[in-house]
């Protein structure tokens, strides 16, 4: 360092403000998701990439099936380590119905409220993981538009496992889950052959979520 080197008024590092995201993960917990620990492994791999804290990224998790449960709120945990421990303990709540519209709408109306830790002016991100067509798909269009109106960026993941197990056509299902994703769809929609393959998309999903920080 030269002797003339001086410290001038410093600029806060870009990373400090850019790491602020409020992320709510909306998990399908119906019985057809199998095995469940593939979901918790996916959560673990995704969450350990995040810098979680009250001034950084916050994560909340909602589980749905026949009804909806807030597993934990955005402001519940203040470190990545705490969130990882909590995510590992999430049990599958079961049920035969897949009320995806209800899950997304509950996340929008409840999980993203200040009471549950959402921060004003911080970008909202929703990650939806499901393995079947919704039983309330007549509500889906409106629910997605409401998310759009509130600037909630949506990543959707279609697990094809139960369709492949039953040798069923995935076409209608994939179209529905694509409709949930934000535009451009090709950057916000993922599909995996089965639950075990969820971990294979973590790196790309993580990169695309973090790319939002810069915008």
């Amino acid at each position: 360092v030269s002797p003339t080197f001086q410290v001038v008024n410093s600029i806060a590092p870009v990373q400090e403000c850019s790491t602020q995201l409020d992320i709510v993960i909306v998990l399908d917990g119906s019985n057809s998701i199998y095995p469940w620990d593939s979901v918790t492994a996916f959560l673990n791999d995704l969450l350990e990439r995040m810098d979680i804290g009250p001034k950084q990224t916050q994560v909340g998790i909602v589980q749905y099936g026949e009804n909806v449960t807030h597993e934990f709120n955005l402001n519940k945990y203040s470190s990545t380590e705490e969130v990882l421990v909590a995510a590992k303990k999430i049990v599958q709540r079961g049920g035969r119905q897949t009320m995806t519209a209800l899950g997304i709408d509950t996340a929008r109306k409840e999980a993203f409220t200040e009471a549950r830790g959402a921060r004003r002016g911080v970008k909202k991100v929703m990650v939806i993981v499901t393995d079947g067509e919704s039983h309330d798909n007549h509500r889906l269009k409106k629910v997605i538009q409401d998310c759009e109106d509130e600037n909630i960026q949506r990543f959707s993941i279609a697990i094809l496992g139960s369709y492949n197990r039953g040798n069923l056509s995935t076409e209608k299902f994939v179209e529905e889950i694509k409709s949930i994703a934000s535009e451009p769809t090709e950057k916000h929609f993922f599909n995996v052959s089965d639950e075990l393959a969820l971990v294979t998309i973590v790196k790309t999903l993580g990169e695309r979520i973090f790319a939002l920080e810069a915008t």
Epitope: S32, P35, W36, E66, R93, R96, S162, R165, G166
Partner: antibody
Framework: EVQLVQSGAEVKKPGESLRISCKGS????????IGWVRQMPGKGLEWMGI????????RYSPSFQGQVTISADKSISTAFLQWISLKASDTAMYYC??????????????????WGQGTLVTVS | EIVLTQSPGTLSLSPGERATLSCRAS???????LAWYQQKPAQAPRLLIY???RRATGIPDRFSGSGSGTDFTLTISRLEPEDFAVYYC?????????FGQGTTVEIK
């Protein structure tokens, strides 16, 4: 804590009817399938059938179809296994077990993660 | 119906030894959907392994499962006194559940 508690041992005569029960607790019983498994004296395990207490959808193993009836009452979180006319060959230990998995959309799959303590049925 | 054949029928070993139990299916088991259960006298079966290799909650790491297709193995790396029991494999890849006939692990 997930628990499946079965009704007590039964001693019956051939031709009599019987209903045994399996009460679940510690989880949403109406949201998980419950299976029934037979174990004859000194023998292995045989899957009999499975029920979804939420709507009483039932599937049977071909070997047990028409031999037994599986039912459930979600209001009391209980599944039942019933015989109209018992035979000596029905003498066995009967277990209920919770399915971690599913049985819809054209396929059944999953493992049994929690088991009841068993009900011994003796027919003689 | 998929038939599962377990071998050997009986395994006589001493505590501390390694136990290798085999389960062979009459046809390919999709997605590795095979589970292993342990049953002790006068007790209900207890889940050990599912999806061929995943240990159930609370199961010690001396138990491990492997295999795919038609051939599956349960290995107990070092037998403890409480491990002497009957072990059953079970498949669930064909819209029904079938069990093997069981392997008894007894004290030599």
């Amino acid at each position: 804590e997930v628990q499946l508690v079965q009704s007590g041992a039964e001693v019956k005569k051939p031709g009599e009817s019987l209903r045994i029960s399996c009460k679940g607790s510690g989880y949403s019983v109406s949201s998980y399938w419950i299976g029934w498994v037979r174990q004859m004296p000194g023998k292995g395990l045989e899957w009999m059938g499975i029920i979804y207490p939420g709507d009483s959808d039932t599937r049977y193993s071909p070997s047990f179809q028409g031999q037994v009836t599986i039912s459930a009452d979600k209001s009391i979180s209980t599944a039942f296994l019933q015989w109209i006319s018992l035979k000596a060959s029905d003498t066995a230990m009967y277990y209920c077990a919770r399915l971690q998995g599913d049985c819809s959309g054209g396929s059944c799959y999953g493992h049994f993660d929690y088991w009841g303590q068993g009900t011994l049925v003796t027919v003689s | 119906e998929i038939v599962l054949t377990q071998s050997p029928g009986t395994l006589s070993l001493s505590p501390g030894e390694r136990a290798t139990l085999s389960c062979r299916a009459s046809q390919t088991i999709s997605s590795g959907y095979l589970a292993w259960y342990q049953q002790k006298p006068a007790q209900a079966p207890r889940l050990l392994i599912y999806v061929a290799s995943r240990r159930a909650t609370g199961i010690p790491d001396r138990f491990s499962g492997s295999g795919s297709g038609t051939d599956f193995t349960l290995t107990i790396s070092r037998l403890e006194p409480e491990d002497f029991a009957v072990y059953y494999c079970q498949q669930y890849g064909s819209s029904s559940w079938t069990f093997g006939q069981g392997t008894t692990v007894e004290i030599k």
